[in-house]
């Protein structure tokens, strides 16, 4: 006869491991007992359990409550056992020794591999600011057995670097994603992808990028100077900028206080019907936690009568 087993049995942490050992004997042969032992190199054999044809399953105190026979129906030539709730410390070499009548003893070894799925964690790097050089955007760490694979999934251009730390029964892998921050990266997802044979599917953790920046400020509303004349209603100046975090706006007048009746509404400066006292230099001050910008414009409110008089003078001068 001969023993049938597996070279390697692989289970995920917490699952039950079936340790197979089947005696394929000639007719009339019977199995008297099957002894299971752990036989890691450098250590003596440690009895796990003994399956006796007459007295049933005997379990070592070290494995009390964790070793069982597979559920019925059972073949008397089957010496397989179930190791319940596999833990990392169960990983190793096991031997099945079968005593048969009348053929004698047979033995076989198998390796139990316990996969420890990783629990990845993603840590964002320091605050990203436009103008920085190559900066850490995020790091992702996963520990498992065997070592997990850690990669990145993103549309953002960057560089990755990985390092691994081996522990007694597992390995921790850390991957870092570096980039040169730019405003176009704002709101872009950066996803850490962890692969491992103990996972049914890859684990993914997504971090949304936030890059602090402040665009140059400009003022709109003076495109047609001829519209800025005495009596005009609804005249306004609008300050244009963008930033992360969103900026706040402040209006001042360089050559004095803001005239009465001028309304400040965030990025917009609204004027009452224009008078010559609205002429002056206006400054839009844009700021966020990252930076501040200024833009100034000169408003020159025209007096149509004065203008036409000038034109007459010019004409008469010619």
């Amino acid at each position: 006869g001969e023993l049938e087993t597996s070279d390697v049995v692989t289970v995920v942490l917490g699952q039950d491991a079936k340790l197979p050992c089947f005696y394929r004997g000639d007719s009339g042969e019977q199995v008297g007992q099957v002894a299971w032992a752990r036989v890691d190199a450098g250590e003596g054999a440690q009895e796990l359990a003994l399956l006796h044809s007459k007295y049933g399953l005997h379990v070592s105190p070290a494995y009390e409550g964790r070793v069982e026979q597979p559920p019925p129906p059972r073949n008397p030539l089957d010496g397989s056992v179930l190791l319940r709730n596999a833990v990392q410390a169960d990983e190793g070499e096991y031997e099945c020794r079968v005593s048969t009548f009348p053929a004698g003893s047979f033995q076989a070894r198998l390796r139990l591999r316990v996969l420890v799925p990783p629990l990845p964690s993603l840590n964002p790097g320091p605050a990203l600011e436009e103008g920085q050089g190559l900066t850490l955007a995020a790091s992702c760490t996963a520990e498992g057995s065997p070592a997990p694979s850690v990669t990145w999934d993103t549309e953002v251009k960057g560089t990755t670097s990985s390092r691994s730390f081996k522990h007694s029964r597992s390995a921790a892998v850390t991957s870092e994603f570096h980039l040169v921050p730019s405003r176009s990266m704002n709101g872009q997802p950066l996803t850490c992808v962890v692969s491992h044979p103990g996972l049914l599917q890859d684990q993914r953790i997504t971090h949304i990028l936030h890059v602090s920046f402040l665009a140059e400020a400009s003022v709109r509303g003076l495109e047609d100077q001829n519209l800025w004349h005495i009596g005009r209603e609804g005249a306004m100046l609008k300050c244009l900028s963008e930033g992360q975090p969103p900026p706040s706006y402040n209006w001042t007048r360089l050559d004095g206080p803001l005239p009465s009746g001028v309304r400040v509404d965030g990025d917009t400066l609204g004027f009452p019907p224009l008078t010559t006292e609205h002429s002056g230099i206006y400054v839009c001050h844009v700021s966020n936690e990252f930076s501040s910008r200024d833009s100034q414009v000169t408003v020159d409110v025209l007096d149509p009568q004065e203008d036409s008089g000038k034109q007459v003078d010019l004409v008469s001068a010619s």
């Epitope: 019977q30 002894a35 009895e47 005997h58 379990v59 105190p61 009348p102």
Partner: nanobody, 119 residues
Amino acid sequence: EVQLVESGGGLVQPGGSLRLSCAASGSISSINLMGWHRQAPGKGLEWVATITRGGSTNYADSVKGRFTISRDNSKNTLYLQMNSLRAEDTAAYYCVDVEPSGMGWRDYWGQGTLVTVSS
């Protein structure tokens, strides 16, 4: 041949404890199994517990959690620690050595030791 001699039996009150011993001599194999059986007055033989050379154990449901079987291989001695004894544990306790033999197993029996649980 294997010879077995039990000791440690006696009278004990319900809830009390006793420790039985069994000294084995003779041609004991490396894959033997040792254990205890008992026979109450007027009843049939009942298996109590068995232990492998490596210390793996198996117990009858009726004694699980109360009785502990152990062995000292260097002295070829078997023990049965009996706690929380009940009247229904009253019986003759026999030590058994189970040896491989030809086409199966051969049981070697001791003479027995009497345990009486009574107030």
